[in-house]
């Protein structure tokens, strides 16, 4: 078990130009706090996975009002450390958010509003008991000076908070075997509780005869590097030679995740999703409320009136989650109508819509026909976003302008000639023909074979086509 | 909107036992705790049982006018609450409602039990 | 166990303010017992007006607000109306146990 600690040395417009409007002014006094965000491993920083070594907010700084025309200064810090207890080993190698937020002091209807001005992210290796480590990190225009270290609480010390130390029983010398606690000199090694054999360097124990493994660490004495990468199954221990995950405890069994918290196993180790007002590696951590500000990306903070849901976040547009810390695809929903091509921008949605719709989701057909004529008596069909116009017989293209050649195709069959005629065309068919289009031919007997004539007409009179 | 019906009161003798259900559409009933809560003829309004959601292993509280005699329980599959009743009292006589706690309160339009020799 | 106080019966004119209050015998209220105001009206009619201390219910009226007033919860109605009156009751959450208040008349004349 342990502390980290972030010291916030600075907050203020970086290096070079653009520098940022100062974020409170005469007319809406605010101030600063701070929430950092810890995560084991390499993790990546997320802002929507758990934090599941743990999270801390500051307390409030003073109030601050910009003096009109001056450039934004650094910015009064809130007084204190940011401290995140961890119960467990600390890992060694940790990822980190820490967002500045700006509490808004002026007449706000139900109470002070908050914004995030800026989050800044890393993934750091660090040894606990070491000394302060300094960061600098840029967000936009803002800069962020800190600095932060890991220590152990007694009676845990070592580089991940695992070897338990305690005040010699004899003045001179620890016990046989145990080794003084460095740099707690007149402090000795406690006597081994762990399972025999346990890793000193990669198993950790909480309970006399258990070992427990570091992260990237197996086997029943934490002895085996993981290595997933010729395994067929996800759990865990199996020989010390390959590194093999094969089927044993999975990390979830008991299920360590506690308030409710649900456990789902990750490659290496396992993760807790929290019910709401729960965090920490284990859900152990509880009693958030509003007034810690538990609320990402500027969701607005309410009561709750039961305990298990102690607060409620109103996310806004783009977010979601109990705490609006998942940002919504809101693309994956299909906002756009008829085939639109959907942008995220973050702060809205736009649809670029294809030829022929437009509106915000593409939702409005346009009239193709709008304002388009076609011509010589051709009539406006709208169709699928675009038009088209049916001409008149003896016209074509895309208006109707063209006049046509209805002979060019060649419609009269067996020989026929074909004439152009006012209102279409007319074959003259070749004898032993007859028909609109020649199709038909005239049995020697004088007969069709199909239709009949029609009345008032001989076979191989020319016959025009309506 | 959230809708609460409850159903299952009626007239029951003493030492007798009684079923009450309550229905829950238009929210998503796994994730919250439900209670019951009821109000005895002319009087104010007293919390009877309380179960959590499948997060917290579905754990049970009582007031304990009613523990041992009480059962509360949930079927998140159907979205319905219920609370059985046994060795049932004079006292117990109350419109029962169905109370889901989240922003605020909801409650059902209640169902009467009548516990009566 | 907690017993949770109010006052038994008010009486306020129309476009006055009043307030009601809730005491916990177990120490000062909190924003950790989700203070929650019902109100009833004739017929067994309950409405949830606030929840967690200060939450105002939709579609209830703004003149109907929330708070933790020294170390009670209390009620305000800011400009009272004479449909306003009811009986309002507060419960108090104690970790899982609610305890409910007697409730408040409140006559609007």
């Known amino acids: 078990a342990g502390v980290f600690e972030l010291q916030i040395h600075s907050f203020g417009p970086g290096p070079g130009p653009g520098a940022p409007r100062s974020p409170c002014s005469a007319r809406l006094p605010c101030r600063l706090f701070f929430r950092v965000c810890l995560k084991p491993g390499l993790s990546e920083e997320a802002a929507e996975s758990p934090c599941a070594l743990g999270a801390a907010l500051s307390a409030r700084g003073p109030v601050y009002t910009e003096q009109p025309g001056a450039p934004a200064p650094d910015l009064p810090l809130p007084d204190g450390l940011l401290q995140v207890p961890f119960r467990d080993a600390w890992p060694g190698t940790f990822s980190f958010i820490i967002e500045t937020w700006r509490e808004e002091l002026g007449d706000q209807i139900g109470g002070p509003a908050w914004s995030l001005l800026a989050r800044v992210a890393g993934r750091r290796r660090l040894a606990a008991g070491g000394p302060w480590a300094r960061d600098i990190q840029r967000a936009g225009a803002w800069e962020l000076r800190f600095s932060y270290r890991a220590r152990c609480e007694p009676p845990a010390v070592g580089t991940a908070c695992t070897r338990l130390c305690r005040p010699r029983s004899a003045p001179s010398r620890c016990g046989p075997g145990l080794r003084p606690c460095a740099p707690l000199e007149d402090e000795c090694e406690a006597p081994l509780v762990c399972r025999a054999g346990c890793s000193p360097e990669h198993g950790f124990c909480e309970q006399p005869g258990e070992c427990r493994c570091l992260e990237g660490w197996t086997g029943p004495l934490c002895t085996v590097p993981v290595s997933t990468s010729s395994c067929l199954s996800p759990r865990g221990p199996s020989s010390a030679t390959t590194g093999c995950l094969v089927p044993g405890p999975g990390p979830c069994d008991g299920n360590p995740c506690a308030n409710g918290g649900s456990c789902s196993e990750t490659p290496r180790s396992f993760e807790c999703t929290c019910p709401r007002g729960f965090y920490g590696l284990r859900c152990e951590v509880s009693g958030v409320t509003c007034a810690d500000g538990p609320c990402f990306n500027g969701g607005l903070c309410v009561g709750g009136a039961d305990p298990d849901s102690a607060y409620i976040c109103h996310c806004p547009p783009g977010f979601q989650g109990s705490n609006c810390e998942k940002r919504v695809d809101r693309c994956s929903l299909q906002p756009c109508r008829n085939g639109g091509l959907c942008l995220d921008l973050g702060h809205a949605l736009r649809c670029r819509c294809r030829a022929g719709f437009a509106g915000p989701r593409c939702e409005h057909d346009l009239d193709d026909c709008a304002g388009r004529a076609c011509a010589n008596g051709g009539t406006c069909v709208e169709g699928g976003g675009a038009h088209r116009c049916s001409c008149a017989l003896g016209f074509g293209g895309r208006d109707c302008r063209e006049r046509a050649d209805p002979c060019a195709a060649r419609p009269c069959a067996h020989g026929g000639r074909c004439y152009a005629h006012f209102s279409g065309l007319v074959c003259a068919c070749a004898p032993g023909y007859m028909g609109a289009r020649c199709e038909f031919p005239v049995h020697p007997d004088g007969a069709s074979a199909l239709p009949a004539a029609p009345p008032g007409l001989r076979p191989g009179d020319p016959q025009r086509y309506l | 909107e959230v809708q609460l019906v409850e159903t299952g009161g009626g007239l029951v003798q003493p030492k007798g036992s009684l079923k009450l259900s309550c229905a829950v559409s238009?929210?998503?009933?796994?994730?919250?705790?439900m209670n019951w809560v009821r109000q005895a003829p002319g009087k104010g309004l007293e919390w009877v049982a309380r179960?959590?959601?499948?997060?917290?292993?579905?754990?049970?509280y009582y007031a304990d006018s009613v523990k041992d005699r009480f059962t509360i329980s949930r079927d998140d599959s159907q979205s319905m609450l219920y609370l059985q009743m046994n060795n049932l009292k004079i006292e117990d006589t109350a419109m029962y409602y169905c109370?889901?706690?989240?922003?605020?309160?909801?409650w059902g339009q209640g169902t009467l039990v009548t516990v009566s020799a | 166990q907690a017993v949770v106080t109010q006052e038994s019966a008010l009486t306020t004119s129309p476009g006055e303010t009043v307030t009601l209050t809730c005491r916990s015998s177990?120490?000062?209220?909190?924003?950790?017992?989700?203070a929650n105001w019902i109100q009833e009206k004739p017929d067994h009619l309950f409405t949830g007006l606030i929840g967690?201390?200060?939450n105002r219910a939709p579609g209830v009226p703004a003149r109907f607000s929330g708070s933790l007033i020294g170390d009670k919860a209390a009620l305000t109605i800011t400009g009272a109306q004479t449909e306003d009156e009811a009986i309002y009751f507060c419960?108090?959450?104690?970790?899982?146990?609610?305890?409910f208040g007697g409730g408040t008349k409140l006559t609007v004349l």
């Open positions: 967690g201390t200060n």
């Open positions: 177990t120490g000062a209220v909190t924003t950790s017992n989700h």
């Open positions: 109370v889901f706690y989240y922003d605020y309160v909801y």
């Open positions: 419960g108090l959450w104690y970790s899982n146990h609610l305890v």
């Open positions: 238009a929210f998503t009933f796994t994730t919250y705790a």
């Open positions: 179960i959590r959601n499948h997060s917290n292993n579905y754990a049970t």
